[in-house]
Interface confidence: low
């Protein structure tokens, strides 16, 4: 009988070990060291320590709860010279023994002849002496070759704790010992762990320990029994260093797209070149500006960054598709557009068929200003009049009379969708200087600045639909609102996250988009709209976007 | 000088009662637990009840629903109250105390060697 008993307590004495040899170290000079542990469930486990052993003596644990009707007792057995463990079962593994108000009075007795001698006593609080089980059913749910996904289970521990417990993990490299090996902490109830940068092809063991929050002397669990696991070999010439490939891809992206800029920006030849591959149909300026072109010899760029008075610009004779250019200086424009607020609106136009368009044509006129931004864009306003020619009687707001070129003028009512100034966000773009320095951030959707905007056409179909109404929190400073498109060169002062105040009442001041929107169409809040530079706006596609203004 | 007195022992007919005492002197209950042992002849001591310093009671599984265990701490005395008596529970019945402690149920050999302060018994028989 004695071999099968002694073959369930081995296990416990193995577990029992660490506790005695880290407290017999404590009994000196005859005094003795009495500490146990509580499982959490039904285990205390106890260690005694006594200097100047007694020899062949019997001892045991005898565990008396203050408010429960049981007692129970468990031999001590030796686990070294001076010191002895056992493990007072008090019930199934997984019952829930104790509380947290109980106090066991706990005893070490030992027997002297026919008597038994009590030899340590102390009032026991379990849960503020915890110490759980090991945890167990460790196991390697993915490995690769630099990392590995090990998961496991606690045993045995009480549902009081919910979810406050922390775990603590160590691995084992070749080569090293455990006392080497550097603690991974989790400071929840996270039972499982993905370990990162790992070598190829390498054996590997891992350990993990759990320990509660609460309790004033409660300790780390026996470590784990050992998980010895292999990292995936390396394939040839490939994964050796996961990140290079990428490192390398996106440095030679890097370099290409720079080369590619630069090539765009310095290369006189890439003009024609550019325009043949995507087949824009651009008309020549040559034909519009005859003087130009005899003066400055077919250079655009030399026209437009010509620093003449606007009067030697006159336009020639105009193909029937395109109004008078007209090209103001710098200031004059940006006052004009801030002022046009003031400007009284005019009657409502009597034509149906009149229009006057306004877009960015970026792709093809560039300034290039001392007091700018590297590149920027040149707003042009094109008017056009399909009609004026056959219905001459039919009065033509925004049209030319004659050969010298018209101010354009602000329309009214429902034409003020079609045909505005940009907002003054917008005026930022040609003239920063003109407006004040930044303001923080908007921080209420659809306030003041953040008009409902609604996107043409070509521009709706790059956005996700995801992006249907939703409230918008405030935006985040250096990312911008359309995350989706690629910003042109002169967005970058609003792509750090500057905005700009609005310079007073935003009526009549709107995009072609800036119409409250309709059914079914896209609407959001506080977007800022770079501008279009994937490709021109026609004016079929201008006139698409409200069947109210079809010609 | 510690003392225990039992008292109240004697021969009852089977389905009886009887009420033993125990009168301390030189210490005070409340920091002591007190308990009953009894020994038959032939047989291991056995913890019958315990009343403890926090008001804890223990009955040995033979004893529950007949016997009853209090104590007058004014008086430093503490009772069994024994109903329902049975043959088998004929024996010696020693009074002890010790402080602030647990009862021992199935670890003692026998009694007066345990731990603490033990009376010298009172005899009770249970005849059928």
């Known amino acids: 009988m004695a071999a099968p008993a002694l073959s369930w307590r081995l296990p416990l004495l193995i577990l029992l070990l660490p506790l005695a040899t880290s407290w017999a170290s404590a009994a000196v000079n005859g005094t003795s060291q009495f500490t146990c542990f509580y499982n959490s469930r039904a285990n205390i486990s106890c260690v005694w320590s006594q200097d100047g052993a007694l020899q062949d003596t019997s001892c045991q644990v005898h565990a008396w709860p203050d408010r429960r009707r049981w007692n129970q007792t468990c031999e001590l057995l030796p686990v070294s010279q001076a010191s002895w463990a056992c493990n007072l079962i008090l019930g199934a593994p997984d019952s829930q023994k104790l509380t947290t108000v109980d106090i066991v009075t706990l005893r070490v007795l030992c027997r002297e002849g026919v008597r038994w001698r009590v030899m340590a006593i102390q009032d026991f609080k379990p849960f503020e002496n915890l110490r759980l089980m090991a945890p167990i059913s460790l196991q390697v749910v993915h490995v690769e070759t630099h990392r590995c996904n090990i998961s496991w289970e606690i045993s045995q521990a009480s549902h009081y704790f919910e979810r406050h417990l922390e775990f603590e993990a160590r691995t084992l490299s070749p080569g090293h010992t455990w006392e080497e090996a550097p603690l991974l902490t989790l400071k929840q109830k996270q039972e499982w762990i993905c370990l990162e940068t790992l070598t190829p092809d390498t054996q590997y063991e891992f350990q993990v320990r759990v320990k509660p929050l609460q309790g004033e002397f409660t300790t780390w669990s026996p470590w784990s029994q050992p998980l010895a696991f292999r990292t995936k070999p390396a394939a040839l010439g490939k994964d050796t260093i996961p990140w290079l490939g990428h490192l390398l891809v996106g440095l030679s992206g890097a370099f290409g797209f720079i080369i590619l800029v630069y090539l765009l920006i310095n290369c006189r030849n890439t003009g024609p070149w550019l325009k043949k591959v995507l087949k824009c149909n651009t008309p020549d300026p040559s034909k519009f500006f005859s003087q130009l072109s005899s003066e400055h010899g077919g250079d655009v760029q030399k026209w437009l960054s010509s620093p003449f008075p606007s009067s030697s610009f006159s336009p020639g004779g105009l193909a029937p598709e395109i109004s008078p250019l007209e090209v103001l200086e710098r200031d004059k424009v940006t006052q004009l557009l801030l002022q046009q607020d003031k400007v009284p609106e005019p009657a409502s136009l009597s034509s149906n068929h009149s229009l006057t368009s306004c877009f960015t044509n970026q792709g093809y006129f560039f300034f290039h200003l001392p007091d700018a931004l590297e590149i920027e864009a040149c707003q042009v306003y094109f008017t056009y009049d399909p009609y004026s020619e056959e219905d001459p009687d039919e009065g033509v707001a925004g049209a030319p009379t004659g050969s010298s070129p018209q101010p354009l003028q602000p329309l009214s009512g429902e034409d003020d969708a079609y045909c505005t100034f940009p907002s003054r966000d917008d005026l930022l773009l040609f003239s920063p200087s003109l407006l004040g320095g930044p303001s923080p951030p908007s921080t209420a959707p659809g306030g003041s600045g953040a008009g409902e905007e609604r996107m043409p056409p070509s521009l709706q179909e790059r956005v996700p639909r995801d992006w249907d109404p939703q409230p918008l929190g405030p935006p985040t400073p250096g990312v911008p609102d359309l995350v989706d498109f690629q910003p042109p060169p002169e967005l970058v002062l609003r792509e750090a996250g500057e905005e700009v105040p609005d310079a007073g009442p935003r009526e009549g001041v709107s995009f072609p988009w800036s119409r409250p929107p309709g059914q079914g169409e896209f609407r959001a809040l506080n977007a800022r709209l770079p501008l279009n530079t994937d490709a021109y706006l026609s004016l079929q596609e201008l006139q698409g976007q409200d069947p109210t203004h079809l010609v | 000088q510690v003392q225990l007195q039992e008292s109240g022992g004697g021969s009852v007919q089977a389905g009886g009662s009887l009420r033993l005492s125990c009168t301390a002197s030189g210490f005070t209950f409340d920091d002591e637990d007190m308990g009953w042992y009894r020994q038959a002849p032939g047989n291991e001591c056995e913890l019958v009840s315990s009343i403890g310093s926090l008001g804890r009671r223990y009955y040995a599984d033979s004893v529950k629903d007949r016997f009853a265990i209090s104590q007058d701490n004014a008086k430093n005395t503490v009772y069994l109250q024994m109903n329902s008596l049975k043959p088998e529970d004929t024996a010696v019945y020693y009074c002890?105390?010790?402080?602030?402690?647990?009862?021992?149920?199935?670890?003692?050999?026998?009694?007066?060697?345990?731990?603490?302060?033990w009376g010298q018994g009172t005899q009770v028989t249970v005849s059928s």
């Open positions: 002890a105390a010790t402080k602030g402690g647990s009862w021992l149920d199935s670890i003692l050999a026998s009694c007066q060697g345990a731990f603490g302060y």
